[in-house]
């Protein structure tokens, strides 16, 4: 085609195009102040405005902050690019129990199959380990390498209380046990594995920084660029990302060039009062008994674990809504129904059981 073999550097004398020797073709010259979206733009739509660092240009042409993967339980899956947010996922050995835009709000450890059970499906970043009864003749303790990892005394084998089949009654009770040490506690103190990918220090494919002399005449090396810690929102406005600096908050998704940072309550807490991209008030989360086991669920991003033991054992424990997701900090419909005084009593030893309503919200059960 003629465009593939232009006259030397002239592009047939068309001033709106230039010849790129690297790709050996004529490219559209973005107007001054705009930034090319590809190496050799072909049309005006291939030009954009420039956002601030850690911001991306969203579908509405607004600079929005990229999410960050700075939480210890997250790793960067894809970097912050000029037109897409950074994407985070749970680090190896953990799965996402509560998803979030471009990230995961809550990661939990993969379950360790207990004695008598073997791994049916290994855990992924999205799904928990699925266990099944061991076949006769197979050593129940070491039916698979993962089963040989025995949890330390006093801990629960699951990463979190696991979902149950939809309850037939409006509420099921669960005793609150004081001697239980939550795996969430341990998770919150863990540091990222040395060989795990990390967003720290790794430049994205396009952080929004331009070459030495941005926007020279005719180069079009520009796009709307918001300041760092700001994102280009849906209306095209540079908007400040929320801060997760409060002690009871952790970063759920980072500040990206086209999406705000989002915060959630730290492990062991649940959002009682939601706020945009954050939580205004976090309260302690109900604790489940160490012996609790549940039935498998065949849904993505759910805590799908092993089958329950025979009848007559501990009652099911399910502090999450029936869909299996933990309450999201930004969802006003999934807040605790206990008052602040009652919420303070939940994590400590008590004889008062906590009931779960049909919506999965914990309420005090007078007994």
């Amino acid at each position: 085609f003629p465009q593939d073999r232009p006259f030397e550097d002239t592009c047939h004398g068309n001033p709106s195009h230039y010849y790129d020797k690297a790709v050996r073709r004529c490219c559209y010259r973005c107007p001054m102040g705009l930034f090319p979206t590809q190496q050799c733009p072909q049309r005006p739509t291939d030009c954009r405005k420039q956002c601030e660092p850690d911001y991306y240009l969203d579908e509405a042409d607004r600079c929005t902050a990229c999410v960050t993967c700075s939480r210890d339980d997250l790793v960067e899956k894809t970097p912050c690019a000029w037109n897409s947010s950074r994407v985070c996922e749970c680090r190896p050995g953990m799965f996402c129990s509560t998803s979030a835009v471009n990230s995961c709000a809550r990661c939990f450890f993969h379950s360790v199959c207990p004695a008598g059970m073997i791994v049916k499906f290994p855990g992924t970043a999205q799904k928990n380990t699925v266990c099944e009864p061991a076949s006769p003749g197979v050593s129940p303790a070491c039916a698979s390498p993962e089963n040989c990892k025995e949890p330390s005394s006093g801990t629960i084998p699951q990463a979190k209380p696991t979902p149950v089949s939809p309850a037939t009654s409006s509420a099921s009770t669960m005793p609150v046990r004081g001697g239980t040490r939550l795996a969430q506690e341990a998770a919150s103190k863990l540091t990222r594995a040395p060989d795990s990918p990390s967003s720290v220090g790794r430049p994205s494919s396009d952080p929004g920084l331009s070459p030495t002399q941005p926007c020279p005449e005719g180069s079009g090396d520009c796009r709307k660029q918001c300041e760092p810690d700001y994102y280009l929102d849906e209306a095209g406005r540079c908007t400040a990302c929320v801060s997760c600096s409060r002690d009871d908050l952790v970063e759920k998704t980072p500040c990206a060039w086209n999406s705000s940072r989002t915060c959630e309550c730290r492990p062991g807490m649940i959002c009682a009062t939601s706020a945009t991209n954050s939580c205004a008030r976090c309260v302690p989360y109900p604790i489940c008994a160490a012996e609790t086991v549940t039935k498998p669920q065949d849904m993505a991003e759910k805590d799908t674990t092993f089958e329950a033991p025979p009848l007559g054992t501990q009652p099911d424990c399910n502090p999450t809504p029936e869909n299996g997701e933990a309450p999201a900090s930004t969802s006003p419909t999934q807040s605790l129904l206990v008052d602040s005084q009652a919420s303070k009593t939940l994590p400590i030893p008590t004889s008062a059981p906590v009931a779960l309503s049909s919506t999965g919200k914990p309420v005090l059960d007078a007994g």
Epitope: F35, P228, G236, R237
Partner: antibody, heavy 119, light 111 residues
Framework: EVQLVQSGAEVKKPGSSVKVSCKAS????????MNWVRQAPGQGLEWMGQ????????NYNGKFQGRVTLTADKSTSTAYMELSSLRSEDTAVYFC????????????WGQGTLVTVSS | EIVLTQSPATLSLSPGERATLSCRAS??????????MLWYQQKPGQPPKLLIY???NVESGIPARFSGSGSGTDFSLTISSLEPEDFAMYFC?????????FGGGTKVEIK
Amino acid sequence: EVQLVQSGAEVKKPGSSVKVSCKASGYAFSSYWMNWVRQAPGQGLEWMGQIYPGDGDTNYNGKFQGRVTLTADKSTSTAYMELSSLRSEDTAVYFCARRINGNFAMDYWGQGTLVTVSS
Amino acid sequence: EIVLTQSPATLSLSPGERATLSCRASESLEYYGTSLMLWYQQKPGQPPKLLIYSASNVESGIPARFSGSGSGTDFSLTISSLEPEDFAMYFCQQRRKVPSTFGGGTKVEIK
């Protein structure tokens, strides 16, 4: 040639407002953030905020939020900074400056507009 | 906001001497492998003039005797051999966080 030409000096009473203009030429006005910086007599520089003329997007220094309003007129390639509820400590030279896309530096500056607030 | 502290406040030197100006930030200015630190020169009655961007890149048209260095929180501007026209005020500026802030300035005066 890139040029930023600001309006002339102003003398204002406390409590009143002032609107300083900055006419740009020689570049694509809509595609560069326009910053506003002020400098009190014998003092340092203070960033007030910036506006993206292409769509009117703004960032403000919280210190001035509510008192400063940045606007831009694409048809005349002119940026405006209005400061209200003036007090004596607002006496300063006000600069407009174009922000480079990419490294956030301000490469071209207006000559400055002296605003004196006195009763 | 990020606080920038410049030192010394005044530097008294003679033409031909080497000048080293310091600027310390209250938190890191690192951003995707670059530091969002800028240096400006200002003479009486004039607007500031961009010298250095991204901590160490010299703006087009600025003499090679000007150089910038540093990363994280500690930065410096060096004038290898002072010329008479270099005696002026110098300001550092950060663009890492909004609001952008400037240092208090260093006055380079003739000794």
